[in-house]
């Protein structure tokens, strides 16, 4: 078998064997090495010398195999846009951002650029659980049978109705999707003016 060519090597068809780690240099019609993540091109290749790479300076990065002559400047997540940081910038990756709690991504351009407050779910509903937090606005779904939710909130969950018999009480009024069961002492009638959930 033929020995594998090591950059720089001539390329007649303008393609290189390893597209990830090599690139075609049209001036000399050769394939040269790209620089690994965390580095940049400090000296371009020639017919007799391969690419020379140097480490990105502090506060800058390159994420991929590249033939860039500079590193990208690290940028913080923008709190004004509702973003928070989940991981710092390193020489090999940009700052990792996500929407702050209670917010969702409202503008996406390769990555999230702007977050907005999640909509409230009205009483009797809850936000459908999503695979990824912050990906989209709330989609409110009704509480399932035997559950209630009595606030307007982006995050409140439906709770099971109180079972009066578990507390030695009897049901005075059944629960609804928006209210808990009302319980009373089995020996006492419920006065009309009292509408609390638990009456001992």
């Amino acid at each position: 078998s033929q020995p594998q060519a090591v950059p720089p090597y001539a390329s007649e068809n303008q393609t290189c064997r390893d597209q990830e780690k090599e690139y075609y240099e049209p001036q000399h019609r050769i394939c040269c090495s790209r620089c690994p993540p965390g580095t940049y091109v400090s000296a371009k290749c020639s017919r007799i010398r391969d690419t020379v790479c140097a480490t990105c300076a502090e506060n800058s990065y390159n994420e991929h195999w590249n033939y860039l002559t500079i590193c990208q400047l690290c940028r913080p997540c923008d709190p004004v846009m509702g973003l928070e940081e989940i991981a710092p910038c390193t020489s090999k990756r940009k700052t990792q951002c996500r929407c702050q709690p209670g917010m969702f991504c409202a503008a996406w351009a390769l990555e999230c650029t702007h977050c907005e407050l999640l909509s409230d779910c009205p009483p009797g509903t809850e936000a459908e659980l999503k695979d990824e937090v912050g990906k989209g606005n709330n989609h409110c779904v009704p509480c399932k049978a035997g559950h209630f939710q009595n606030t307007s909130s982006p995050s409140a969950r439906c709770q099971p109705h109180t079972r009066c018999e578990n507390q030695g009480l009897v049901e005075a009024a059944p629960g609804t999707a928006q209210s808990d069961t009302t319980c009373k002492n089995p020996l006492e009638p419920l006065p009309p003016e009292m509408s609390g959930t638990m009456l001992m």
Partner: antibody, heavy 116, light 107 residues
Framework: QVQLQQSGPELVKPGASVRISCKAS????????LHWVKQRPGQGLEWIGW????????QYNEKFKGKATLTADKSSSTAYMQLSSLTSEDSAIYFC?????????WGQGTTVTVSS | DIVMTQSQKFMSTSVGDRVSVTCKAS??????VAWYQQKPGQSPKSLIS???YRYSGVPDRFTGSGSGTDFTLTITNVQSEDLAEYFC?????????FGSGTKLEIK
């Protein structure tokens, strides 16, 4: 060269607050994160949070939310940490540190002693 | 939170020996690990970043290795001035977390 100069030791009463400072020099203050780290005597290191002086935004370890407040003054290149409602658990050495792939630069530490 | 475990609290060694301090992350942190040396009454001093990059001015007897979850700081030809506590730290995700430390004792 990068230097982080911290304020002197503090003796404070339980329930009180204290503010310690970290003056930066030798680099552009507004373009690097400044972190705060707690070390209790004979114990390990705990990350409190960071402040980015460029936009004066801070982010905290959940454990220290409500305990520590991080601020920065661009004009004097100084970062501050206020600790509130102090208890004996807050007696520790507090370090500021500038980050880049870890913490290459550290202040000398400020000892906070909480005692009545 | 990611837990960084340094299982050996103390390690005893002799001048000229080789010693390895280990650190295990509770989840994959890539190579985003730093090592620090702390002497009594002093601030931590940065030795290694990116798991294996040695800071300038740090003697070449200090070597870092590992990726993913298992990391090692190796000191070859131990010197008396290496008597200190050594901490690992992950900076892969917030909150940053440190190992509990390994104290190196010189016999």
């Amino acid at each position: 060269q990068v230097q982080l100069q911290q304020s002197g030791p503090e003796l404070v009463k339980p329930g009180a607050s204290v503010r310690i400072s970290c003056k930066a020099s030798g680099y552009t203050f507004t373009t690097y994160y400044l972190h705060w780290v707690k070390q209790r005597p004979g114990q390990g290191l705990e990350w409190i949070g960071w402040i980015y002086p460029g936009n004066v935004h801070a982010q905290y370890n959940e454990k220290f939310k409500g305990k520590a407040t991080l601020t920065a003054d661009k004009s004097s290149s100084t970062a501050y940490m206020q600790l509130s409602s102090l208890t004996s658990e807050d007696s520790a050495i507090y370090f500021c540190a500038r980050s880049w792939e870890g913490f290459p630069y550290w202040g000398q530490g400020t000892t906070v002693t909480v005692s009545s | 939170d990611i837990v960084m475990t340094q299982s050996q609290k103390f390690m005893s060694t002799s001048v000229g020996d080789r010693v390895s301090v280990t650190c295990k992350a509770s989840q994959n942190v890539g190579i985003n690990v730093a090592w620090y040396q702390q002497k009594p009454g002093q601030s931590p001093k940065s030795l290694i970043s990116s798991a294996s990059y040695r800071y300038s001015g740090v003697p070449d007897r200090f070597t870092g290795s590992g990726s993913g979850t298992d990391f090692t700081l190796t000191i070859t030809n131990v010197q008396s001035e290496d008597l200190a506590e050594y901490f690992c730290q992950q900076y892969d995700t917030y909150p940053f977390t440190f190992g509990s430390g390994t104290k190196l004792e010189i016999k």
